[in-house]
């Protein structure tokens, strides 16, 4: 058993049929010594008396808010949550496995630049009685500070018969050094509580590996005289790190016909313009990637040819 | 070239070679970012590689003030990785095929380090740890970890030379 926050405790249980459970001793936070009784949740049934209560925690029915009273007055509360371990593996019932980039990916994180700011998100099908708390640091043995905001519901989607809820959180490294080569990864820890179930999820990454630039901006076409060719030009996204002579991007320009089956013409360039042939009903798209480190490509920015 | 008097390197040449290094480092093992490298007996592996840290003057402002600190750090790293790529970790079993990009990568690391430090001028170099894995699978794991950290190192070096070529070239 360990304290999650004031008056909230997590009991770690090996979860299998007829498991013995854990013996837990609760102590009433009061100077009083006599006439103390204990109840669980809304029930008025007295579970025991005295300053301490010893209980055997085996299942969710044994978890909940234990309250000690004296003469009708509430003295203190202790909320017990359960953390299940099945076959040596902690349960992951609350969040959905996003399976990208690999199985058992519950948290996904992205950064738009090297400023030390990043966003993480996760998915669940649970709609109520759900709370999240997020902590982060750079490194684990001698951790350096990363400040995270509160997790918020950022999207709702319908997936077949199920509703899926996306939560996200923004974090910022306290003393970020954008030009340095990271040697210690960022660690992100999410505590999830659904009713009386506690779970924790972690992710470890370098900012460089989660970079995904915003799409190029101000994508424009300029027809070239007496030619089917056009000059495509664009700019670095506003959110990308500066100066651009240091934090450089590379670009992929694609000409795509109306039909998905049509052959795509692709050009790669480090410049912010390119000359391509504009076919009728086609569209031109440009995306960006860090020039020197193969992290994710941005989403496409597109304009029609006509 | 970075010579004892602290004059400028051939920024444009360094830019071209460092960008080539980036390409080679990724082609040497493109999947490296998606490998699950957590294995038993794997803790001590590449914690000793030189990193370009915050105080090394490799940021745009530091380069403007005095690029020598940063160039020395990059040079140390290039020599370090060049030695690792020439060691038993990469020459031992399982063997790399003759057309593996690791050979080109090794040569390019040497080429860039020589551009930064011509004959007769010696910067201090960092001690190369004696990593001599006894098992072929450990050698394989070390390769991936070394390539992964090399990818990060050469990315910073390439940014430095790109910025230098754009803003510090005479």
């Amino acid at each position: 058993i360990w304290e999650l926050k004031k008056d909230v405790y997590v009991v770690e249980l090996d979860w299998y049929p007829d498991a013995p459970g854990e013996m837990v001793v609760l102590t009433c936070d009061t100077p009083e010594e006599d006439g103390i009784t204990w109840t669980l949740d809304q029930s008025s049934e007295v579970l025991g008396s005295g300053k301490t209560l010893t209980i055997q925690v085996k299942e969710f029915g044994d978890a909940g808010q234990y309250t000690c009273h004296k003469g009708g007055e509430v003295l203190s509360h202790s909320l017990l949550l359960l953390h299940k371990k099945e076959d040596g593996i902690w349960s992951t019932d609350i969040l959905k496995d996003q399976k990208e980039p690999k199985n058992k990916t519950f948290l996904r994180c992205e950064a738009k630049n090297y400023s030390g700011r990043f966003t993480c998100w996760w998915l669940t099908t649970i709609s109520t009685d759900l709370t999240f708390s997020v902590k982060s640091s750079r490194g684990s043995s001698d951790p350096q500070g990363v400040t995270c905001g509160a997790a918020t519901l950022s999207a709702e989607r319908v997936r077949g018969d199920n509703k899926e809820y996306e939560y996200s959180v923004e974090c910022q490294e306290d003393s970020a050094c954008p030009a340095a080569e990271e040697s210690l990864p960022i660690e992100v820890m999410v505590d999830a509580v659904h009713k009386l179930k506690y779970e924790n999820y972690t992710s470890s990454f370098f900012i460089r590996d989660i970079i995904k630039p915003d799409p190029p901006k101000n994508l424009q076409l300029k027809p070239l005289k007496n030619s089917r060719q056009v000059e495509v030009s664009w700019e670095y996204p506003d959110t990308w790190s500066t100066p651009h002579s240091y934090f450089s991007l590379t670009f992929c320009v694609q000409v795509q016909g109306k039909s998905k089956r049509e052959k795509k013409d692709r050009v790669f360039t480090d410049k912010t313009s390119a000359t391509v042939i504009c076919r009728k009903n086609a569209s031109i798209s440009v995306r960006a990637q860090d020039r020197y480190y193969s992290s994710s490509w941005s989403e496409w920015a597109s304009v029609p040819c006509s | 070239r970075a010579v004892p008097g602290g004059s400028s390197p051939a920024w444009t040449q360094c830019q071209q070679l460092s960008q080539k290094l980036c390409t080679l480092a990724w082609s040497a093992h493109p999947l490296v970012g998606h490998m699950d490298l957590r294995e038993e007996g794997d803790e001590e592996t590449t914690n000793d590689v030189p990193h370009i840290q915050c105080g090394d003057g490799c940021d745009p402002q530091g380069l403007r003030d005095n690029s020598q600190f940063c160039l020395q750090r990059i040079h140390q790293g290039l020599i370090f990785y060049e030695k690792l790529l020439g060691s038993d970790i990469f020459t031992g079993e399982p063997s790399l095929l003759p057309d593996s990009p690791v050979g080109q990568l090794h040569a390019s690391l040497l080429g860039l380090s020589q551009l930064l430090q011509p004959e007769g001028h010696h910067w201090e170099t960092q001690q190369i740890p004696s990593l001599s894995p006894s098992q072929p699978w450990q050698r394989l794991l070390l390769r991936f970890k070394i390539l992964r950290s090399l990818q990060a190192f050469v990315a910073v070096a390439a940014r430095v030379f790109a910025h230098g070529a754009a803003t510090l070239s005479p």
Epitope: - | H29, L31, D36, E93, P94, S95, W137, L140, R143
Partner: antibody
Framework: QVQLVQSGAEVKKPGSSVKVSCKAS????????ITWVRQAPGQGLEWMGE????????YYNEKFKGRVTITADKSTSTAYMELSSLRSEDTAVYYC???????????????????WGQGTLVTVSS | DIVMTQSPDSLAVSLGERATINCKAS???????????LHWYQQKPGQPPKLIYN??KPESGVPDRFSGSGSGTDFTLTISSLQAEDVAVYYC?????????FGGGTKVEIK
């Protein structure tokens, strides 16, 4: 075509040594390793060790505690396995096999004993 | 040393029936999660062994009735429809750690 031709059968006294040769042809000798495997009569296979002429690396089965020495002569494309302090339980067929042990992006850990010698019967008897 | 335990020691199967050979390692013989350092060899009487499965991949020329599966410590070689020419002793071999070790062998015969 690839061939590994081993030296002929040997009868040895306990305490003596035996040196089995394995002449390789039909491929570039230094591009592959040579592995030695033995098989006692009616028994299973036992890996003794292997040598890679290109890297110069030799790996041994510690079970033989310094009794086995594996070498290669690049000039004649011949591998050798010497076993000393022979005892009756060393009676076995000794095989050499070509070892391909490579790493590529597609196959990061490819190991194959793809061609084998015909085997050399070593009998240890007083 | 990694100990490789094969089961069963011998197996008699009717022609056209399925034969399943198991190999259990005393330690994990996969590398970084998925790459297998476990191989299967076939040895017919009076002949040297022949590689049939390399990691998770069949060697070229090996009939597709042979299939290898497994990861971590438990591996299986399956012959989906036994043919007369499949009568042999089958060995698993791990080359994750030196010394490389073979399983004790499984003799496959026709019932």
């Amino acid at each position: 075509q690839v061939q590994l031709v081993q030296s002929g059968a040997e009868v040895k006294k306990p305490g003596s040594s035996v040196k089995v040769s394995c002449k390789a042809s039909g491929y570039t000798f230094t591009s592959y390793g040579i592995t030695w495997v033995r098989q006692a009569p009616g028994q299973g296979l036992e890996w003794m060790g292997e040598n890679y002429p290109r890297s110069g690396n030799t790996y041994y089965n510690e079970k033989f505690k310094g009794r086995v020495t594996i070498t290669a002569d690049k000039s004649t494309s011949t591998a050798y396995m010497e076993l000393s302090s022979l005892r009756s339980e060393d009676t076995a067929v000794y095989y050499c096999a070509r070892a391909e042990f490579i790493s590529t992006v597609v196959a990061p850990y490819y190991y194959a004993l793809d061609y084998w010698g015909q085997g050399t019967l070593v009998t240890v008897s007083s | 040393d990694i100990v490789m335990t094969q089961s069963p020691d011998s197996l008699a199967v009717s022609l056209g029936e399925r034969a399943t050979i198991n190999c259990k390692a005393s330690k994990k013989v996969t590398i970084y999660g998925s790459t297998s350092a476990l191989h299967w060899y076939q040895q017919k009487p009076g002949q040297p062994p022949k590689l049939i499965y390399n990691g998770a991949k069949p060697e070229s020329g090996v009939p597709d009735r042979f299939s290898g599966s497994g990861s971590g410590t438990d591996f299986t070689l399956t012959i989906s429809s036994l043919q007369a020419e499949d009568v042999a002793v089958y060995y698993c071999l791990q080359n994750k750690e030196v010394p490389y070790t073979f399983g004790g062998g499984t003799k496959v015969e026709i019932k």
